[in-house]
Interface confidence: medium
């Protein structure tokens, strides 16, 4: 889910990201791998570069919360809303929240964190939902094997519309 009006993009190439806390049922190393793979999906097709930081502020802040968590967009327990992210032009740019009450995994059990993170980070980069079912920005969760996952042409076109191609420099 994307939150707040916003048509902006990030006006820089290099974005930092930080994983602030972790879910109950996934090893921190697996969470780190999932988030790393998710940001890499987007950097592979744009000029964007993502750098993980361990402390302090970051452009993209990933965290796990449950129920109401003081951003006005409460989670709803297992199932339902899996996560939400704020668009770059919102009051909370780069904030990515996942529902702590989901069963997160790096496989096909529960909800695959890599897939949901790729979707939410898409929002945090400025992408809206897509009605194209093959798009990672489709609003309903669909499982794909993360090892063979690829962005759809629709995803690539829209993210490059914002940031340009990998070898281009369409950011001012």
């Amino acid at each position: 889910t994307s939150i707040s009006p916003g048509r902006c993009k990030w006006n820089k190439h290099t974005l930092t990201y930080r994983i602030i806390n972790y879910p109950h049922d996934m090893k921190p190393s697996a969470v780190k791998d999932s988030i790393y793979n998710a940001v890499s999906i987007w950097s592979n097709v744009t000029p964007l570069i993502f750098q993980q930081v361990q402390n302090g502020d970051a452009d993209i802040k990933v965290s796990f919360w449950q129920w109401a968590h003081e951003d006005g967009w409460p989670f709803d327990g297992p199932g339902g809303i899996l996560g939400h992210a704020f668009l770059p032009n919102s009051g909370n740019p780069g904030v990515v929240h996942f529902d702590k009450n989901e069963h997160w995994s790096a496989s096909d059990t529960g909800y695959n964190l890599f897939l949901v993170a790729t979707h939410e980070i898409g929002h945090s980069l400025g992408l809206q939902h897509s009605g194209n079912q093959s798009s990672i920005m489709y609003p309903t969760y669909w499982y794909h094997d993360p090892r063979t996952f690829q962005l759809s042409a629709d995803d690539i076109q829209r993210i490059q519309h914002l940031y340009g191609e990998k070898c281009s420099s369409d950011i001012p």
């Epitope: 009006p5 939902h129 009605g131 194209n132 042409a153 519309h161 001012p172």
Partner: antibody, heavy 119, light 110 residues
């Protein structure tokens, strides 16, 4: 104040070529998507082409693909549309329009330049 | 498809409300929230009045509102005024790096 001023329109024979220009001022040209949109006499609007801020990405309507080329010179704050192999159905007022940051809608438009393709 | 479907004309008396529809497909209007509306007075350039389905640029009166349901977008002009008489065009991103306009609706204030 944002201003867009198109030029280069005129009468051309079928099969001929024309280059339209759009001089931009009042904003940082190099930061915005730009579009060309046309309107045949008495008809509706038709999107023609779009170009990314640095010129690295270009889009075209199927009706002009392979015949028209969009380009820009950010040092001159100018947008161009090179039109080749012109047809009677290309007759229209051509508007230059500034794209919003996502590029999918246009918030400022020029007053247009008329292109007439006729023998 | 080459064009979104709009009614060719609509009308209303001053002070009334008028709604203009814009019907596309699941590949354009239904697929994205990139729907915008333009107002064009005779002999003038189009003016953006709605973007991203229902957002108004600054300076556009709140008499103009819009929404989307499924493959159909709608523009409502409430409290009609004489200066609202114009042509109105909807526009949508249509995937594959293309944009598509509606055929236009001529709004007459009676």
């Amino acid at each position: 104040e944002v201003q867009l001023l198109e030029s280069g329109g005129g009468l051309v024979q079928p099969g001929g070529s024309l280059r339209l220009s759009c001089a931009a001022s009042g904003f940082t040209f190099s930061q915005y998507w730009m579009n060309w949109v046309r309107q045949a006499p008495g008809k509706g609007l038709e999107w023609v082409s779009g170009i990314g801020p640095s010129g690295g990405i270009t889009y075209y309507a199927d009706s002009v693909k392979g015949r028209f080329t969009i380009s820009r010179d950010n040092s001159k704050n100018t947008l161009y549309l090179q039109m080749n192999s012109l047809r009677a159905e290309d007759t229209a007022v051509y508007y230059c329009a500034r794209g919003e940051e996502d590029g999918y809608n246009s918030d400022y438009w020029g007053q247009g330049t008329l292109v007439t393709v006729s023998s | 498809q080459s064009e979104l479907t709009q009614p060719p004309s609509a009308s209303g008396s001053p002070g009334q409300s008028v709604t203009i529809s814009c019907t596309g497909t699941s590949s354009d209007v239904g697929a994205y929230n990139y729907v915008s509306w333009y107002q064009q007075h005779p002999g003038k350039a189009p003016k953006l009045i709605i973007y991203e389905v229902n957002k108004r640029p600054s300076g556009v009166p709140d008499r103009f509102s819009a929404s989307k349901s499924g493959n159909t977008a709608s523009l409502t002009v409430s409290g009609l005024q004489a200066e609202d008489e114009a042509d109105y065009y909807c526009n949508s991103y249509a995937g594959s790096n293309s944009l598509i306009f509606g055929g236009g609706t001529k709004l007459t204030v009676l």
